[in-house]
Interface confidence: low
């Protein structure tokens, strides 16, 4: 999906009002310096691409993020503010429902959500222009 035409300000508002707090709740009890940020993004569409990938694509050691509160709110924000996003996600969602396993908060998931926090922060801070 091409995130270029999303309403970035509305997505930012959704992040600030709820998603950020849900990410913090998920990470509660974890030191902010425990994980190093290894994933980054260069502009808002790129950030959303990375956020979408980390939030909804199961990875080795962490297959259970898609049903977390922050993930559902992320999905809702993208569905509302990114034209055509919902349609592209129908098949992916069906596939995810079939292979969803018991919810377990692993260290790998905590690391992945820490990366997500970094990506969201980058999304919310358009880089200053180089002068």
């Amino acid at each position: 999906y091409d995130f270029t035409n999303c309403d970035f300000e509305k997505i930012k508002a959704a992040y600030l009002s709820t998603i950020s707090k849900d990410l913090i709740t998920y990470m509660s009890g974890t030191k902010s310096t425990e994980f190093n940020n290894t994933v980054s993004c260069s502009n808002r569409p790129h950030c959303l691409t990375e956020i979408q990938s980390l939030t909804f694509n199961p990875t080795a050691g962490c297959a259970s993020l898609a049903k977390e509160m922050f993930a559902m709110k992320t999905k809702a924000a993208l569905a509302i503010w990114c034209p055509g996003y919902s349609e592209t996600q129908i098949n992916a969602t069906q596939a995810m429902k079939k292979r969803r396993k018991r919810k377990v908060t692993t260290n790998k998931c905590l690391e992945q959500v820490s990366q997500l926090q970094g990506l969201w922060r980058r999304f919310n801070r358009p880089l200053l222009k180089q002068q």
Epitope: N37, R125, K129, Q130, Q131
Partner: antibody, heavy 121, light 105 residues
């Protein structure tokens, strides 16, 4: 623990330049902005400029544009502020301050201890 | 540049009294940050984004406001509260107010 450690006090003559350093530790240096703020004796805080260590992008207070240069050394997690053509009214304490997106706005959540710059002939 | 005007410049009160500090912006801003500064020290974040208390700040402090008018309130002054308080915005670059000194009467 986040720490910003600044270089020591400087005494400079009018017309000279000064370069103050700010060594960051305890967080990912490229994740946050770095501000520079100064405070003349008995005066208000005065914002000078901001730099993104991620890409070196800067924004300056128009009052200082042309005289102040902000740079970073990512490998050393250090930010620098250079002020040129010094005059007596530049005598002040200079602070670096990390800017973080904690709530609904960019706030300066950690500050260096300050570097006193005295400009005197 | 958005100019922030703080009033009063000095507030002389006794411990136990209520303190109300005002910060007015020359143009509307989204929210305001507040910092506390004591002599010889760097400023410390005190209230984020109008009403969020920074870590370790006692509940007797509160912040409110919108648009061009913002307020920091101390419900009951304690000896450690006597300091200078600065408001700061970032809607347009970053600017600080002139500060309000809360001193012991």
């Amino acid at each position: 623990e986040v720490q910003l450690v600044q270089s020591g006090a400087e005494v400079k003559k009018p017309g000279a330049s000064v370069k103050v350093s700010c060594k960051a530790s305890g967080y990912t240096f490229t994740d946050d902005y770095m501000n520079w703020v100064r405070q003349a004796p008995g005066q208000r805080l005065e914002w000078m400029g901001i730099i993104s260590p991620y890409n070196g992008g800067t924004s300056y207070n128009q009052k200082f544009k042309g005289r102040v240069t902000l740079t970073v050394d990512k490998s050393a997690s250090t930010a620098y502020m250079e002020l040129s053509s010094l005059r007596s009214e530049d005598t002040a304490v200079y602070y670096c301050a990390r800017e973080d997106y904690d709530y609904d706005g960019y706030a300066m959540d950690y500050w260096g201890q300050g570097t006193t710059v005295t400009v005197s002939s | 540049e958005i100019v922030l005007t703080q009033s009063p410049a000095t507030l002389s009160l006794s411990p136990g009294e209520r303190a109300t500090l005002s910060c007015r912006a020359s143009s509307s801003v989204s929210y305001m940050h507040w910092y506390q500064q004591k002599p010889g020290q760097a400023p410390r974040p005190w209230i984020y984004a109008t009403s969020n208390l920074a870590s370790g700040v006692p509940a007797r402090f509160s912040g409110s406001g919108s648009g061009t008018s913002y307020t920091l309130t101390i419900s009951r002054l304690e000896p450690e509260d006597f300091a200078v308080y600065y408001c700061q915005q970032w809607s347009s670059d970053r600017t600080f107010g002139g500060g309000t000194k809360v001193e012991i009467k």
